[in-house]
């Protein structure tokens, strides 16, 4: 992947939401939860009320890029996910609307979405070389890979 | 079995300080924030605050900032409120309550403590 | 801050009627509204979360609906376990206020 400072200068541009009301889930079946106000971490769950439900918005780069790029917002709120470095917990950023124009720092709003099969990746638009993952005992957070877990199943329509 | 197990009830003086604390058992204390709730005698709910178990901040209502101090034992998983220069009007039954967001966003306190009456009289 | 305005204050019903509490929020609060059912000498206790899904073990005769800023708790067939103070809280925004209770008692 190229180096951030490379992508630094490009901008993106929101473009919809094109997913509202998904929960995801690790490979091990864990829901992500939000726990402590601005962090998120997976838990197996005997409720599904009890996960977190997502929004994604989807974002158009300046560079004409192949990769779809998304916003990551609870559903119902104005918290956005937001990557920190590698190993930190991804914290929830308040904001008073969706971001109509993102460049610079601001990236680490966003994500590229990947999907293979059922497996969905969520790869840091700020650290291209790193994933939204869940680690035991700990938050969700960026992580290159295991033992880390970086791939999720997205439900959808949960009543 | 999810537990919060507080201290038992107190008398003290006007002036004087008191400290209630809240044993967690159960769960993973670092993942819910602690809140606390008085109720006062034949009175309602109020929500004075909460404390993230995680950072160790807090938030205060309006009404309960200045003399109460929400802090923690994360090593036994117990959280403290304190109360200095007590006052009769300060005689009430307090509460921890384990708070849970529900679809991430819904704020609720799904498990309570037993309470803990302070009285506080001359 | 949220205001949250319950009513009525207290009410006197026979066993199996049917009980309705409302819960009125200053402003909109996106269902994110929950019950708790407090019986006498004893700690309060989470029914309905999410203005009406039922806690676990929770009794189907309640049950809650409503959207925007006003909300209602029901109790569709009274029973005598019922008598308590039932309270409603928003948990869209702290401070998570309370309403101001509504005591239940038996004809």
């Known amino acids: 992947s190229a180096p951030f400072s490379f992508l630094s200068n490009v901008k993106y541009n929101f473009m919809r939401i094109i997913k509202y009301e998904f929960i995801l889930n690790d490979a091990l079946n864990q829901s992500i939860i939000r726990a402590n106000d601005q962090y998120l971490t997976a838990a197996a769950l005997h409720n599904l009320d009890e996960a977190v439900k997502f929004d994604m918005g989807a974002y158009k780069s300046s560079k004409d890029d192949a990769k779809i790029t998304v916003i990551l917002r609870i559903s119902k709120t104005q918290l956005y996910v937001t990557a920190q470095d590698e190993d930190q917990p991804v914290l929830l950023k308040e904001m008073p609307e969706i971001p109509k124009t993102i460049t610079g720092s601001e990236t680490n709003l966003l994500f590229f979405w990947e999907t293979h099969g059922t497996k969905n990746y969520f790869t840091s638009v700020a650290h291209p070389n790193l994933f939204i993952a869940t680690k035991q005992d700990y938050w969700v957070c960026l992580a290159g890979g295991p033992p880390s877990i970086t791939d999720f199943q997205i439900l959808e329509n949960q009543a | 079995e999810i537990q919060l197990v507080q201290s038992g009830a107190e008398v003290k003086k006007p002036g004087a300080s008191v400290k209630v604390s809240c044993k967690a058992s159960?769960?993973?204390?670092?993942?819910?924030?602690m809140n606390w709730v008085r109720q006062a005698p034949g009175q309602g709910l109020e929500w004075m605050g909460w404390?993230?178990?995680?950072?160790?901040?807090?938030t205060y209502a309006d009404d309960f900032k200045g003399r109460f101090t929400f802090t923690l034992d994360t090593s036994t998983s117990t959280a403290y409120m304190e109360l200095s220069s007590l006052r009769s009007e300060d005689t009430a039954v307090y509460y921890c309550?384990?708070?849970?967001?529900?679809?991430?966003?819904?704020?609720?306190?799904?498990?309570w403590g037993q309470g803990t009456t302070v009285t506080v009289s001359s | 801050d949220i205001q949250m305005t319950q009513s009525p204050s207290s009410l006197s019903a026979s066993v199996g009627d049917r009980v309705t509490i409302t819960c009125r929020a200053s402003?909109?609060?996106?269902?994110?509204l929950n019950w708790y059912q407090q019986k006498p000498g004893k700690t309060p206790k989470l029914l309905i979360y999410?203005?009406?899904r039922l806690r676990s073990g929770v009794p189907s005769r309640f049950s809650g609906s409503g959207s925007g800023t006003d909300y209602t708790f029901t109790i569709s067939s009274l029973q005598p376990e019922d008598i308590a103070t039932y309270f409603c809280?928003?948990?869209?925004?702290?401070?998570?206020?309370f309403g101001q209770g509504t005591k239940l008692e038996i004809k």
């Open positions: 809280q928003q948990g869209k925004k702290p401070p998570y206020t």
């Open positions: 999410y203005t009406s």
């Open positions: 402003q909109d609060i996106s269902n994110m």
């Open positions: 404390i993230n178990t995680y950072t160790g901040q807090s």
């Open positions: 309550a384990r708070g849970i967001y529900y679809f991430g966003s819904n704020y609720a306190m799904d498990y």
């Open positions: 159960g769960y993973t204390f670092a993942h819910y924030g």
